[in-house]
Amino acid sequence: CKAMHVAQPAVVLASSRGIASFVCEYASPGKATEVRVTVLRQADSQVTEVCAATYMMGNELTFLDDSICTGTSSGNQVNLTIQGLRAMDTGLYICKVELMYPPPYYLGIGNGTQIYVIDPEPCPDSDF
């Protein structure tokens, strides 16, 4: 299969609500009409799939119903949002893009975005 460059930010800090967003950009060598995007988490040399979606160019990304990810596409950019993150989810999140159709098939894997998640401090009880 043919290789393709994928770019993503090096570091992202999740919001206090446990939401992190980043852009995954790929250098499409041709005019792909069908794309598959997968987010993988690498931590302690273990790689696990976080979510995956396919989309037709110009349409919304379709994630599984129980996915913690949402996303939109614009040209060769995919805007990804991961929700429900906690401190233990801190890790390297890698964007993988496959151009499924038309042939030839292209595969690109980004260097990863280090997402830092800080659990919010509980509000102290206040005496009135």
Epitope: C1, T38, L40, Q42, V47, T48, E49, A52, I94, K96, L107, I109
Partner: nanobody, 119 residues
Framework: EVQLVESGGGVVQPGGSLRLSCAAS????????MGWFRQAPGKEREFVAD????????YYADSVKGRFTISRDPSKNTVYLQMNSLRPEDTALYYC????????????WGQGTLVTVSS
């Protein structure tokens, strides 16, 4: 060294069926994904189908959706491609491929098995 060996190719009439097999040997097989690609003479290599082994989730190219089925038998380290309602345009060399991890890419490839659909 991991080896992938395909079998099951042959000549079949339009509308017929074939079942391709891909057996992995020579290593440990906690593959992230296994898939099938094909290449017709003078054409680019094309994605056909894959299965992501942890979730058992399958994905198909539009051109084969509803006609081809990918499955696996972990106990035999084997992945299958059941091909029904074959068409002349399905004629190609079919390759099995394996992804050791989600970020490795398709590191392992078989030698291919030829499928010819002709009356």
């Amino acid at each position: 060294e991991v080896q992938l060996v395909e079998s099951g190719g042959g000549v079949v009439q339009p509308g017929g069926s074939l079942r391709l097999s891909c057996a992995a040997s020579g290593g440990t097989f906690s593959f992230y994904g296994m898939g099938w690609f094909r290449q017709a003479p003078g054409k680019e290599r094309e994605f056909v189908a894959d299965i992501r082994t942890s979730a058992g989730r399958t994905y198909y190219a539009d051109s084969v959706k509803g006609r081809f089925t990918i499955s696996r038998d972990p106990s035999k380290n084997t992945v299958y491609l059941q091909m029904n309602s074959l068409r002349p345009e399905d004629t190609a060399l079919y390759y099995c491929a394996a992804e050791p991890s989600g970020i490795s890419g398709w590191d392992y490839w078989g030698q291919g098995t030829l499928v010819t659909v002709s009356s």
